[in-house]
């Protein structure tokens, strides 16, 4: 019997009864948060052989071994993982051994066994026989092996029953418990599983089988299960499901869901029955079970229950990630925030259509609305009082709406309103009227010419660059000296520059009023000599890198209530000169004959220009005399080079004896101080542990229902 889609057993150990008769758990198995120590001996689930996702055990009091609960669990497929892990055993206070003596395969993912104070028999299991790669396993903070005294069956009687393998240069017996060996198949089976009698299973079997070389006798399938047979691929007119079995179209159509997309049911795509179309695809019609590629970003309709979505933080913006059509109204009220412009772009940058109105008020953190970089249509199906569908009020630092040279925005219905935006030039608002098709809809008071742009130098003159000089890491630029009507109104210039691989940047990219700015800024004082053109040397730049540069004149903005003219340049794109590339990476050499060497390498990480060729140099080295000191044809052991003597197990030392020469003949060494790299590694390790623990807690703790 297939159980699923994931079983969560918590608080009450009697919930374990839900596992009765399950042969396959299609999904995960959580057993957790059972705080009262119970006697689990009466609970046994011998039918359970496969978990298709992962197994998670966390804080289950009184459970001493998993072997009695799941004596025949053979395969954990890891089709979906818990933070990259297929088996997690965390803070199991009473667990003494894992004991899953029939576990033969974890198909995908690693294991994490951490903070189990009583857990032994960890060093006796060879995980490389179960997993493809053991490098990502995390086994930390359990009972120290020295306190365990793990003994495999028969060792005490000097009649060892288990087989040996090598782990970390230690050749030892492999077992799960004091009376259960770790099963190993004969080498003749290769990668194939085997029966209890060591006969090789069919290649399509995984873990084990009840009869040799029979694809209907597998305990689990290497690829897919269909109609009692293990098959390498699903037959025609059937589809992969949950990574392990084949189902027909009717089955797929009749899956009921209680997840986000359940209004439309499951789909069939690329030979698989799945919950939703994958990224880049959309259903071919709302009732369709098939997917077609999207043109551009896939449409995602988002709806706000309360009709108006207030964006007052990054967190609230996060809810709109991926949305292309927003059904409702947007109220943007961003007073403060860190790196707000790029965060908002990340979460709201795909919105193309807003069906209601857009209102931006008291958003003092915003300099530009360019974070809504794909907005092309405001329908105005719902409007604010006064028939406004675009309303901009009291935004103290708003300077730009959008870059109208690269923006098409239509406001289908409703008027615009602008007031108390002191840095927003009226010319910018008038330009929006033209682009959006709202010109003529607004009445006189809708765009206030007195309190919009009152603190900005609006009517800008253009500053022209007069010369540019480049080297590998420097740019020198000069520009015409700007002369406003009254020279005292000109204070200084500000040069803005940044890396720009493409010629598509705008002045307001990544800029907000809280200090975040993707542009580097340099102030340039006026040259004392009126005939000298202002200029700057930008240094510390990267070789062969394109930079965007523009200059702004810093002027007094108010002269007796008249707007005065400001000045800024166009954006100039300029590339630094090429330089010597960094060294080629990962150089490998191997000999494939007595007279040839094959040398391979990867390109340098910093080419610093267009690479045209490589120079390979080589020279003959004298032969190492050490190689001739031993007769390699003799049966004696090849000598092992000894590099240092006199070291002892650090753990055995209670006080560090002081020695003058570390590693010499004068006695044991002090523990060397940790290198910066080791300290950093320890810090990262501690950080990683915290991140995992947070993930665990966030995933499994849910608030009590009211």
């Amino acid at each position: 019997e297939i159980c699923g889609p994931g079983i969560d057993i918590r608080n009450d150990y009697q919930q374990l009864k839900r596992l009765e008769n399950c042969t396959v758990i299609e999904g995960y198995l959580h057993i957790l948060l059972i705080s009262k120590a119970e006697d689990y001996r009466s609970y046994r689930f011998p039918k359970l052989t496969v978990i298709t996702e992962y197994l998670l055990l966390f804080r289950v009091a009184g459970l001493e071994s998993l072997g009695d609960l799941f004596p025949n669990l053979t395969v954990i497929r890891g089709w979906k993982l818990f933070y990259n892990y297929a088996l997690v055993i965390f803070e199991m206070t009473n667990l003494k051994d894992i004991g899953l003596y029939n576990l033969r395969n974890i198909t995908r993912g690693a294991i994490r066994i951490e903070k189990n104070a009583d857990l032994c028999y960890l060093s006796t299991v060879d995980w490389s026989l179960i997993l493809d790669a053991v490098s990502n396993n995390y086994i930390v903070g359990n009972k120290p092996p020295k306190e365990c005294g793990d003994l495999c069956p028969g060792t005490m009687e000097e009649k060892p029953m288990c087989e040996k393998t090598t782990i970390n240069n230690e050749y030892n017996y492999r077992c799960w418990t004091t009376n259960r060996c770790q099963k190993m198949c004969p080498s003749t089976c290769g990668k194939r599983a085997c029966t209890e009698n060591n006969e090789c299973c069919h290649p399509e079997c995984l873990g084990s089988c009840s009869a040799p070389d029979n694809d209907t006798a597998c305990v689990a399938c290497r690829h897919y299960y269909y109609a009692g047979v293990c098959v390498p691929a699903c037959p025609p007119n059937t589809y992969r499901f949950e990574g392990w079995r084949c189902v027909d179209r009717d089955f797929c159509a009749n899956i009921l869901s209680a997840e986000s997309s359940d209004s439309e049911g499951f789909v069939i795509h690329d030979g698989e029955c799945m919950q939703e179309c994958p990224s880049g695809f959309i259903r071919n019609g709302s009732q369709s079970m098939y997917c077609i590629p999207c043109e551009g970003p896939c449409p995602k309709v988002c709806e706000e229950e309360k009709k108006t979505k207030t964006i007052d933080s990054v967190t609230s913006a996060q809810m709109l990630q991926g949305c292309t059509i927003f059904k409702g109204n947007l109220l943007i009220n961003i007073r403060r925030g860190n790196n707000i412009a790029s965060e908002l772009e990340n979460f709201m940058g795909l919105i193309e259509v807003v069906t209601g109105y857009v209102k931006i008020r008291h958003s003092h953190a915003l300099v530009s609305l360019s974070f809504l970089k794909n907005l092309r249509l405001i329908l105005g199906e719902e409007q604010l009082e006064g028939n406004y569908s675009f309303y901009v009020l009291d935004n103290q630092n708003l300077q730009q709406l959008w870059d109208w040279d690269h923006r098409n925005l239509t406001i289908k219905a409703g008027k615009m309103y602008f007031a108390f935006n002191p840095k927003l030039c009226v010319s910018e608002i008038y330009r929006m009227e033209e682009v959006t098709g709202t010109k003529g809809r607004q009445s006189k008071g809708d765009i206030n010419t007195r309190n919009n742009g009152e603190r900005a130098s609006c009517e800008s003159d253009v500053l022209h660059f007069t010369s540019t000089t480049t080297s590998k890491n420097r740019i020198i630029i000069t520009w015409h000296r700007y002369r406003p009507p009254d020279y005292r109104d000109l204070i200084s210039f500000t040069v803005y520059y940044k890396e720009a691989p493409f010629k598509n940047v705008t002045e307001y990219d990544g800029q907000d009023a809280c200090g975040s700015n993707s542009w580097n800024m340099v102030d340039v004082d006026l040259p004392p000599n009126k005939d000298v053109e202002p200029g700057i040397l930008l240094h510390g730049l990267k070789p062969w890198t394109q930079y965007a540069v523009y200059v702004k004149a810093v002027t007094l903005t108010m002269v007796e209530n008249d707007h005065i003219r400001g000045a800024k340049s166009e954006i100039l794109y300029i590339r630094t000169n090429a330089s010597v590339p960094s060294i080629p990476l990962d150089v490998l050499s191997a000999s494939n004959s007595s007279s040839q060497l094959i040398v391979k390498w990867n390109p340098p990480s910093l080419p610093n220009g267009n690479l045209s060729y490589y120079i390979v140099r080589w020279q003959r080295q004298p032969q190492d005399g050490y190689l001739y000191r031993h007769n390699y044809c003799s049966k004696d052991k090849i000598p092992i080079r000894k590099y240092a003597d006199g070291t002892i197990d650090i753990e055995e030392v209670t006080e560090n004896p002081k020695t003058e020469v570390c590693g010499g003949e004068k006695g044991p060494c002090c523990a060397c101080p940790k290198t910066e790299a080791e300290k950093q590694a320890e810090k990262e390790e501690a950080e990683y542990r915290k991140v995992f623990e947070n993930f665990l807690h966030n995933s499994i703790f849910v608030p009590r229902p009211e």
Partner: nanobody
Framework: EVQLVESGGGLVQPGGSLRLSCAAS????????MAWFRQAPGKGLEFVSA????????RYADSVKGRFTISRDNSKNTLYLQMNSLRAEDTAVYYC????????????????WGQGTLVTVSS
């Protein structure tokens, strides 16, 4: 943990109608696929109908198609089964069941079950 309580069962004449209700408490109701099963005297458990979390999709056993309608009200945490044109063979104890996330057509082992309500169709 989800608690389910069925109501609305009783004696009804053939051709008559009955509406069963199932009140759920505990976790977020909409995150469960809900179903009705029944067990006739001396018989095994039989699937009747199931409904998706939003209530937009439903599935019925062939024996009840066109006669029974399953629905849910997520704001009231309640599942319903409207039974029309009842027959003698519909006599059974009707159980309400809930399964988190989703339910495949071959799933009979739902995670949570009610105690059942008896429906008797007899003249």
């Amino acid at each position: 943990e989800v608690q389910l309580v069925e109501s609305g069962g009783g004696l009804v004449q053939p051709g008559g109608s009955l509406r069963l209700s199932c009140a759920a408490s505990g976790r977020t109701f909409s995150s469960f696929v809900m179903a009705w099963f029944r067990q006739a005297p001396g018989k095994g458990l039989e699937f009747v109908s199931a409904i998706s979390g939003s209530g937009r999709q439903a599935r019925y056993a062939d024996s009840v198609k066109g006669r029974f309608t399953i629905s849910r009200d997520n704001s009231k945490n309640t599942l319903y089964l409207q039974m029309n044109s009842l027959r003698a063979e519909d006599t059974a104890v009707y159980y309400c069941a809930a399964n988190p996330r989703r339910a495949t057509p071959d799933l009979s082992r739902y995670a949570y079950w009610g105690q059942g309500t008896l429906v008797t169709v007899s003249s």
